[in-house]
Interface confidence: low
């Protein structure tokens, strides 16, 4: 399947050029998306190209600037947030990144009614998190690990928590492991729908072992960064959930929400909180052994001013074949009766599908079914449920948006996106206004991305929000590689792959092959999306064939494939990459003396193990920021897939699956090992141990470290990294510079 427009005229081809590495590093061919910042059923905000904040009304067609770029510039604001009563805007500046999602910033409150910044009782700085209540203009914020509340922006703050302490007690924000591996947010507080209550998590990291690493900076002595970071089997954070009445916060203070007895009986996690009404809240909990999850619906008891979570409102989700959920346990989407809900979990055939839970999970009504997976529930209204899936034409790497009419019986299903721009758009997400009156569709490819606005009743396209015209024009004289997505059937396993081929690809010739691998549990690399990136350049300019393969452990193709790696990381993911390479060689156009593999993070782990597999298939390979032993990685992630590193659990496979155990096998390959010294996620320790094992085995290898860089290797390090890797591959493949 050719996913790029083919070039027809020879005369045109002469004027066309290949991609350069500079194109990639400069982001010359990056695309834009348009996500409306919805503020009602028919209105949204958007930051214009000249940095004005503009309010658009779809129904009247009018737009007006609510905040000028001059006001934004006056405090160097990089972000904003309108209060729901439209009286105030917070402006965010001095952004300072912490971990993947978290950052601190300075916040200013601008009063739209008088066009001035609010003076008096200004917010402290830097703030770790700040948000408006869903109604009115109350503010909740986190400063120095404690939560504060303001009834109005100019009011003095009410301090809700007092025990917050750096690296010890976190209130309203997650610690490192909850941020990265459980919540995937920078916040851990949630307003009730009308702003009556504020729920928040408290994380106690007092007993967690600390990872310490040097940050070299510019000073005479390096700083030491200390992060409470539970590695596999270590002591975990202790979490508690509290709810406070924000109308009378001093009346009874924060009330703790009880943990279900079957969860509290051993180590556990809190996984998410969903408000149902102002007086009903849904909490999700997970046993440390992550195959049992409990969804608990709790009600406010006015007489006692407490939260009651009856056992009859506990819903248990258990996996007998793997871990609970996909990457995370799915969250419920409640219906209008405020007790029943829709949720994605595995059906009896082992495919993730939407279920409707009215009383018990056992009696759940299955809403979708088939040998494909429902991926996300976007919105439930009184008569429609919108979701995404990879059902259409049986391509797991696609995403289309569907509507199920739940107001009529029997419910009918309609694919909203399948035939809109079929060649250009096969991978969508969506963003809905209140009550789904309108929605935006964002198409990520395989053609050039496009964002459009639609009527939520009729699904009619109203207008194009962003079509990337400049990008389209810029690509007109570029020889892009060809891409195809196909599958291999091997021993009852389906291996989907994406192959990126040089523009003048000729099946009768032999090409060097580069495998790009990630391969982590519940990931997907073979997706029908647009990208002009480093591997596009390697195909376009350097004439390489690049392949991405989704093997066992990857997502959205059923539990059999997904859970195949349960408790056995590092085995089947590697086997399937090797199997695919053998199949690619059989296709006849691969030079089997020039095959390489590279990957980052989990992909660095897989590429390292593949190079050390002893197959003789790979000439060389690169591991960027690899995991080298699962004992070095975070408890929440690792134990989900591997169990505990204890003798009576899975210690043996923890030991067997290290890169270090295979040091000898690197003797016959060229290995480039790369890591940032300030990697808070996959610690530099991982690569340090690989290097030590290789030295001890007297195996030659190449290495590059990036001082003070984290897991993303950003900024100038990115340019250096890709330049360095390009040289390494060209040398490996005997390509001239």
């Amino acid at each position: 399947i050719v996913l790029r427009p083919s070039r027809v005229h020879n005369s045109e081809e002469n004027t066309m050029r290949a991609l350069t590495l500079k194109d990639i590093l400069n982001g010359t061919f990056s695309y834009k998306t348009f996500f409306p910042n919805w503020i009602s059923g028919q209105e949204y905000l958007h930051q214009s190209a000249d940095n004005n904040i503009v309010l658009y009304n779809i129904e009247t067609g009018q737009s007006y600037t609510i905040l000028s770029n001059r006001t934004m510039k006056s405090v160097n604001a990089s972000n904003y947030g309108l209060s729901p009563d439209r009286q105030f805007v917070y402006l965010e500046s001095d952004y300072s990144k912490l971990w993947r999602y978290s950052y601190t910033a300075t916040y200013y409150i601008y009063d739209l009614s008088n066009g001035e910044f609010v003076r008096g009782n200004e917010l402290p700085r830097p703030i770790q998190y700040l948000c408006w209540s869903p109604v009115g203009s109350k503010l909740a914020y986190v400063y120095q690990n404690n939560i504060y509340l303001k009834q109005r922006p100019g009011d003095p703050p009410f301090q809700i928590t007092f025990n917050g302490r750096e690296n010890k007690i976190f209130n309203g924000i997650p610690d490192w492991v909850y941020e990265e591996e459980m919540l995937a947010t920078k916040y851990a507080l949630w307003w009730s729908p009308n702003g009556k209550f504020l729920a928040y998590a408290e994380f106690n990291d007092t007993d967690i072992p600390v990872i310490a690493y040097s940050y070299y900076g510019d000073e005479q002595y390096p700083r030491t960064i200390n992060i409470p970071y539970p590695k596999a089997g270590a002591k975990n954070p202790v979490v508690r959930i509290f709810i406070i009445d924000t109308t009378y916060p001093a009346y009874v203070g924060p009330q703790e929400v009880p943990v279900p007895a079957m969860i509290a009986s051993s180590d556990y996690y809190f996984s998410w909180l969903t408000w149902v009404t102002d007086e009903r809240v849904c909490l999700q909990w997970l046993k440390r052994v992550q195959n049992v999850s409990v969804l608990s619906i709790c009600d406010f008891r006015e007489d006692w001013q407490t939260w009651d979570c009856p056992k009859t409102q506990e819903h248990i989700e258990e996996s007998r074949t793997g871990w609970a959920g996909g990457f995370f346990v799915s969250t419920p989407v409640f219906s209008y009766d405020a007790i029943s809900y829709y949720k994605i979990f595995s059906d009896k055939d082992g495919y993730k599908h939407i279920h409707y839970i009215k009383d018990t999970v056992e009696n759940a009504i299955q809403i979708t079914s088939g040998k494909w997976e429902a991926i996300n529930i976007f919105r439930v209204t009184q008569d429609s449920l919108f979701y995404s899936s990879n059902e259409f034409e049986e391509y797991p790497g696609r995403r289309n948006i569907y509507r199920i009419s739940i107001g009529s019986y029997p419910p009918s299903k309609k694919c909203v996106t399948c035939h809109l721009r079929k060649e250009r758009c096969q991978y969508y997400t969506a963003s809905f206004s209140d009550y789904a009156k309108y929605y935006a569709l964002v198409c990520y490819g395989p053609g050039i991305p496009i964002s459009t606005l639609h009527d939520g009743r009729t699904d009619q396209e109203i207008k194009i929000l962003e079509e990337n015209k400049e990008l389209e024009n810029a690509l007109k004289n570029i020889q892009l590689p060809k891409e195809e997505i196909k599958k291999l059937e091997v021993d009852e396993i389906t291996l989907w792959y994406k192959m990126i081929l040089p523009p003048q690809f000729d099946r009768s010739k032999k090409y060097p092959l580069l495998i790009q691998v990630y391969g982590g549990p519940c990931s997907q690399s073979v997706r029908s999306v647009f990208a002009v990136n480093w591997i596009s350049y390697l195909a376009s300019k350097e004439g390489m064939v690049i392949a991405l393969v989704d093997g066992r452990g990857t997502a959205f193709q059923g539990d059999k494939l997904l859970y195949a790696v349960y408790r056995k990381l590092g085995v089947y993911e590697v086997e399937d990459q090797i199997t695919a390479v053998r199949k690619f060689i059989e296709m006849g156009f691969i030079d089997e003396k020039r095959i390489a593999i590279w990957g980052w993070s989990y992909g660095g782990y897989v590429s390292s193990l593949a190079l050390a597999s002893g197959t003789g298939l790979f000439k060389c390979g690169i591991a960027v920021a690899p995991v080298s032993s699962w004992e070095y990685y975070a408890s929440v992630y690792t134990e989900r897939f591997m169990g505990l590193p204890t003798k009576d659990d899975n210690l043996e496979h923890y030991k067997n699956s290290t890169v270090m155990a295979r040091a000898e096998y690197f003797r016959n390959v060229d290995y480039l090992l790369i890591h940032g010294t300030a990697d808070d996620n996959v610690h530099f320790q991982n690569s340090a141990q690989i290097a030590k094992a290789l030295v001890n085995a007297q195996v030659d290898f190449q290495a590059m470290w990036y001082s003070d860089q984290n897991h993303g290797l950003s900024g100038l390090s990115t340019n250096h990294l890709y330049t360095h890797m390009t040289h390494f591959l060209k040398q490996c493949f005997s390509l001239s510079d």
Partner: antibody, heavy 123, light 108 residues
Framework: DVQLVESGGGVVRPGESLRLSCAAS????????MTWVRQAPGEGLEWVST???????????YYADSVKGRFTISRDSSNNTLYLQMNSLRAEDTAVYYC?????????????WGLGTLVTVSS | EIVLTQNPGTLNLSPGERATLTCRAS??????LAWYQQKPGQTPRLLIY???TRATGIPDRFSGSGSGTEFNLTISSLQNEDFAVYYC??????????FGGGTKVEIK
């Protein structure tokens, strides 16, 4: 096939001790809560004690008030064996003791039972 | 502690008849209730769990119903092999796990 085989019963005097064993096979022993239930002659079923693994590698144990402080439940996951150490035995402890496997990881209903071992406490 | 009361203590019925056994809980057992069958000299056998889910290999003449504090086990048409003692058990609120006193189903 799941199998539970109890042993260690016998006749003892009041105040003496006895250790019951239950050899388990056919399932992943460490993953399931295991329970001792007893039945006095001609009487109904009475729960005695339960043991289950917690996520941190610890085990949690639970006892009926009538045996608390006298009986100790334990398990050896390496050889798939459940134990009940019974000290300070009384006449009212006379019963057939069954070992039972929980139906799921967390729930404590019992889908498999052993054949039982008889404990008689008599002076 | 949840106390389970089973009624009647003994039920005299003929083969082919319908049997309804009742189990009352002193406080809510939610949906966490199981039923067992025990024949003389034999080990208990799980029939029903989670109020109404039949255990593996249990014939469909056995069915469970109820919720909260009132539960029933129904045997739609008694077979000779069904004459035994039946126990209910709650696992909603424990420790302690509790069993009912049992109902003996005898041949009339």
């Amino acid at each position: 096939d799941v199998q539970l085989v109890e042993s260690g019963g016998g006749v003892v005097r009041p105040g003496e001790s006895l250790r019951l064993s239950c050899a388990a096979s056919g399932f992943i022993f460490r993953n399931y809560a295991m329970t001792w239930v007893r039945q006095a002659p001609g009487e109904g079923l009475e729960w005695v004690s339960t043991i289950r693994s917690s996520g941190s590698g610890r085990t949690d144990t639970y006892y009926a008030d009538s045996v608390k402080g006298r009986f100790t439940i334990s398990r050896d996951s390496s050889n798939n064996t459940l134990y009940l150490q019974m000290n300070s035995l009384r006449a009212e402890d006379t019963a057939v003791y069954y070992c039972a496997k929980s139906g799921t990881f967390w729930d404590t209903f019992f889908d498999y039972w052993g054949l039982g071992t008889l404990v008689t406490v008599s002076s | 502690e949840i106390v389970l009361t089973q009624n009647p203590g003994t039920l005299n019925l003929s083969p082919g008849e319908r049997a309804t056994l009742t189990c009352r809980a002193s406080q809510s057992a939610g949906r966490n209730l199981a039923w067992y069958q025990q024949k003389p000299g034999q080990t208990p056998r799980l029939l029903i769990y989670d109020v109404n889910t039949r255990a593996t290999g249990i014939p469909d003449r056995f069915s469970g119903s109820g919720s909260g504090t009132e539960f029933n086990l129904t045997i739609s048409s008694l077979q000779n092999e069904d004459f035994a003692v039946y126990y209910c058990q709650q696992y909603n609120n424990w420790p302690p796990l509790t069993f009912g006193g049992g109902t003996k189903v005898e041949i009339k």
